[in-house]
Interface confidence: low
């Protein structure tokens, strides 16, 4: 059992290319940093894996379609939005996100767990910030993205709690 750090989340929803500059921000303390994650702030556009069956990102060939901002080939800083489960470990998911160029990984819990979060153990996948959020929060974000809304998350280090029991997948 180890201590766990919560994550402050500032999430914004914005409909792209409408000419409307107003963004709705939502601040909460609803995430927890992974046990092997850097304890650092990070921000980026949330991007789920491509394809309806790829939410768990357990296939090593999983891709992410990342928006561009600087020019036709330049990706914004982005955070992979991945669902827990699917037969692979947290480390597998986070490492895949890192390999694809994500600045962080946001893992959302299984369906049916509502807003429950757990401390993730992901040895070896230590290059990017990794947090877990609840299923309800993750599903809300995912559905927004699927409707064409750009969702951005700013993650800041919260408070220390613990000890909790670690989970690897």
């Amino acid at each position: 059992a180890e201590a766990v750090w919560t994550a402050y989340l500032n999430v914004s929803w914005r409909v792209p290319h409408t000419g409307v500059n107003r963004t709705v921000w939502e601040l909460s303390e609803e995430g927890v940093y992974g046990q092997d994650s850097p304890l650092e702030p990070v921000a980026g556009v949330l991007v789920p894996p491509d394809g309806p069956g790829a939410l768990n990102a357990c296939n090593p060939h999983t891709n992410f379609t990342v928006p561009t901002v600087w020019g036709s080939t330049v990706q914004v800083s982005w955070l992979a939005l991945i669902q827990r489960g699917g037969g692979c470990t947290f480390a597998d998911k986070i490492h895949l996100a890192y390999e694809r160029g994500a600045s962080g990984a946001v893992i959302f819990n299984f369906p049916g767990t509502r807003n429950e979060v757990i401390p993730m153990s992901h040895p070896g996948a230590v290059d990017i910030v990794a947090i877990m959020i609840g299923n309800l929060k993750g599903t809300k974000i995912l559905q927004s993205i699927q409707r064409g809304i750009q969702v951005t998350m700013v993650i800041e280090v919260g408070k220390k709690h613990g000890p909790w029991v670690n989970h690897y997948s």
Epitope: S12, P41, A43, G44, G101
Partner: nanobody
Framework: QVQLQESGGGLVQAGGSLRLSCAAS????????MGWYRQAPGKEREFVAA???????YYADSVKGRFTISRDNAKNTVYLQMNSLKPEDTAVYYC????????????WGQGTQVTVSS
């Protein structure tokens, strides 16, 4: 609000080098994507290089292998090392910072003039 202050521009002979700096100040709570654009006389502003939070770098084809972008996160500063400069690199160079609350709308610096003589 975010303010950007560029420096390092000037006049240099072809084949020479310059190092541009851009310091961001203001309401910055997390590290941001930062980059450089340029605008030559009579032309549109064009992308030069960018670096994201994860230190992934991007370059326009015209500057690959000659320009290097880097950043100092502690100082919220981005640098552009320009080597083997050519007359066609002559332009006003603009620093840009991408903020997450204004999608696709970077903050721009005032620009710094780079002139490469032949």
């Amino acid at each position: 609000q975010v303010q950007l202050q560029e420096s390092g521009g000037g006049l240099v002979q072809a084949g020479g080098s310059l190092r541009l700096s851009c310091a961001a100040s203001g309401n910055i709570s997390v590290q941001l994507d930062m980059g450089w654009y340029r605008q030559a006389p009579g032309k549109e502003r064009e992308f030069v290089a960018a670096i994201n939070q994860g230190t992934t770098t991007y370059y326009a084809d015209s500057v690959k292998g000659r320009f290097t972008i880097s950043r100092d996160n502690a100082k919220n500063t981005v640098y552009l090392q320009m080597n083997s400069l050519k007359p066609e690199d002559t332009a006003v160079y603009y620093c840009a910072v991408y903020l997450y609350d204004i999608w696709n709308h970077p903050y721009w610096g005032q620009g710094t003039q780079v002139t490469v003589s032949s």
